[in-house]
Interface confidence: low
């Protein structure tokens, strides 16, 4: 009789596999397995220029885990082409879509350009590509748009060669000329599109009330209603300037609270290049412009200009050592210009204006001097107009402009004054131009 044996039962437990995942278009899956069971996982990686999306929302990464019931814990994401979005506007310029109308996705190309004649592109060539990281990027790797910088030193006037003893300016002759009204009439010269270069003494009295400065650009007639109004955001007076103790370091910058629109009547003056001294040697001709006192002893109605030669520095120093002028007035930070015979000079009311020279290589005008001081009688024979020597202050100018920003904030609030001050009480016997 056969012996009885019990049932042998084998229990085997197989985890429920999850549906086989398929990588989305423009994506790949890792790791690839024959099947995926409980606790197995996979990740999805998108090709360069594509981003992971769950529904409509971007993901940093994606990993799905196979659950006990054989379902994935997350739905499959998609790999969507990166969209850099509309490129930033370019002030004083424009953007053109190269790839196609308003195409802003990965590898799309745009071209920035600046308004012709009055602006030039800085930083790069203006060509930007939508990169995989979602940023419009230039060939040099910059993510911020280029800058349209105003072209400086353009003038309708061809060089003189031969405003006191001067001539009437025509529209566009001195588009950098700025009229500053406040305590008294003064002048300045536009730098870039939101800075004014002037003399420290011209705005010293208003240094703590800069917002009261009435700044006018594009004017030809002093009293004309046709001008562009600007206001000061901040005033920077050279820390080495001491009021009423001579005119050394007689230089100041005014930051405007808004950028001005550049056109044929409003254009900045260039700052001197390193090579500029070769155009400012003794007897080279500079041009001063302003609405200061004329030969008739009145402020000029029309903007006037005068072509005057640079005077040898020693000759100028000697001229101001004679009585009634005390020694040491003319420093290495000054240059002199005028005719030995007199008759052509800048004068009171021209203070702060630019003495400009033509750079024969670039054919652009640059500021070589700032109208500072001179003899009691403008245009006096044997005396000369004294100008702040701008080339000595290029590091100071550039430092302030880079530290305090190229762009006007456009914001409200009162204008501020910035400087280091050491006040000395000392009589002076030169006249302020």
């Amino acid at each position: 009789m056969a012996s009885m044996t019990g049932w042998k039962i084998h229990y085997t437990s197989t985890a429920q596999p999850c549906p086989y995942p398929m990588a989305p278009p423009n994506g790949h899956l890792s790791p690839v397995q024959a099947k995926y069971i409980l606790k197995d996982s996979f990740s999805i990686f998108c090709e360069p220029g594509y981003e992971l999306l769950q529904g409509h929302l971007p993901l940093k990464s994606f990993a799905a885990v196979c659950q006990k019931d054989g379902s994935w814990d997350q739905p499959m994401p998609s790999c969507s082409i990166v969209d850099c979005g509309p490129p930033d506007d370019l002030p004083s310029g424009r953007v053109e879509y190269i790839t196609g109308p308003e195409v802003t996705t990965y590898k799309a190309v745009i071209q920035y350009s600046c308004e012709e004649t009055f602006y030039t592109m800085k930083v790069n060539d203006g060509k930007y590509v939508c990169e995989a990281d979602g940023f419009w990027t230039s060939s040099k790797g910059e993510r911020s748009p280029p800058v349209c910088e105003p072209v400086c030193g353009l003038s309708a006037r061809t060089t003189g060669g031969r405003i006191y003893g001067g001539q009437k300016a025509k529209p566009g002759d001195f588009p950098w000329q700025v009229l500053i009204l406040g305590g008294s009439t003064a002048a300045g010269a536009l730098l870039y599109d939101n800075w004014v270069l002037t003399a420290a003494h011209a705005i010293y009295e208003q240094k703590h009330d800069a917002s009261s400065l009435d700044i006018r650009l594009g004017a030809l007639k002093r009293l004309s209603p046709h001008y562009t109004q600007a206001w000061a955001e901040a005033v920077f007076i050279h820390e080495g300037y001491t009021h009423d103790a001579g005119f050394d370091n007689d230089i100041a910058l005014i930051k405007l609270n808004n950028k001005v629109v550049i056109n044929s009547n409003i254009t900045p003056i260039c700052l001197p290049r390193k090579e500029a001294e070769s155009f400012m040697r003794t007897d080279d001709i500079g041009t001063a412009s302003g609405w200061g006192l004329t030969q008739r002893g009145l402020l000029a109605r029309n903007l006037m200009y005068v072509d005057i030669p640079i005077v040898d520095h020693q000759k100028c120093t000697a001229a101001y050592e004679k009585p009634p002028y005390s020694g040491g007035s003319v420093t290495a930070n000054m240059l002199c210009a005028g005719l030995e015979s007199g008759g052509k000079d800048s004068c009171r009311g021209d203070s702060g204006g630019a003495l400009v020279f033509l750079d024969n290589e670039t054919q652009r005008w640059f500021v070589g001097g700032i109208v500072s001081w001179g003899s009691m009688n403008c245009g006096e024979a044997g005396q000369y107009g004294v100008y702040t020597k701008v080339i000595n202050y290029i590091p100071w100018i550039k430092n302030i402009i880079s530290n305090f920003g190229g762009g006007g904030s456009g914001g409200g609030g009162s204008a501020k004054f910035v400087a280091a001050w050491t006040l000395k009480a000392a009589a002076h016997h030169h006249h302020h131009h």
Epitope: Q54, L57, P58, K60, P86
Partner: antibody, heavy 125, light 107 residues
């Protein structure tokens, strides 16, 4: 103080159109995704649409797709909802809201942190 | 779409009592649940985000917990101003949905 003020609601016939506006203040508008959420009288809340901070993408619930358009003007700190082909079931108070994005466990999700007081839209003949 | 079911529909309690409101999701939503309070004639107000994260300016008596499909909003000691309708919302799915609400009323 964050403020969202809706306007533009009113009575409109079925098939008609309405444009809602939301004026935002007290925060950096162009940093926020914005949304419209509605609430039918005596009922619960229902998300309608979202627009990303820069206006580059818009999202809608299925029942309003093709009929409603969400848009924004960052220069004016304003959000809009253009509603066309209105139906009776669109009757609701429409709220404008900031939608704060947040990364959580690998994906981007939103919740509604600031709300306006709402504007009533009634679709009836 | 992910359906959120809140319970109870109405909860009657007295000031000083502890309130426990429930929100259940039709599928796992991880911790992507947010709670709002709405009083009659007013807009909703965010109370809790991501299941348990507190919101600045919201009293400490409001707390949240839960993960996956089951979530709870707890009010430790009811104040008279807490009687209102409470909604949960999920952001796990890109089609955001809200629960139907729980009305908390004074007993």
């Amino acid at each position: 103080e964050v403020q969202l003020v809706e306007s533009g609601g009113g009575l409109v016939q079925p098939g008609g159109s309405l444009r809602l506006s939301c004026a935002a203040s007290g925060f950096t508008f162009n940093d926020y995704n914005m949304a419209w959420v509605r609430q039918a009288p005596g009922k619960g809340l229902e998300w309608v649409a979202t627009i990303l901070f820069d206006g580059s993408r818009t999202y809608y619930r299925d029942s309003v797709k093709g009929r409603f358009t969400i848009s924004r003007d960052n220069a004016k700190n304003s959000l809009y909802l253009q509603m066309n082909s209105l139906r009776a079931e669109d009757t609701a108070v429409y709220y404008c809201s900031t939608e704060s994005p947040y990364y959580s466990e690998g994906y981007y999700q939103g919740y509604f942190d600031y709300w306006g007081q709402g504007t009533l839209v009634t679709v009836s003949s | 779409e992910i359906v959120l079911t809140q319970s109870p529909a109405t909860l009657s309690l007295s000031p000083g009592e502890r309130a426990t409101l429930s929100c259940r999701a039709s599928q796992s939503v991880s911790t992507s649940i947010h709670w709002y309070q709405q009083k009659p004639g007013q807009a909703p107000r965010l109370l809790i985000k991501y299941a348990s994260r507190s919101i600045s300016g919201i009293p400490a008596r409001f707390s949240g917990s839960g993960s996956g499909t089951d979530f709870t909003l707890t009010i430790s000691s009811l104040e008279p101003e807490d009687f209102a309708v409470y909604y949960c919302q999920q952001s796990y799915s890109s089609l955001y949905t809200f629960g139907q609400g729980t009305k908390l009323e004074i007993k």
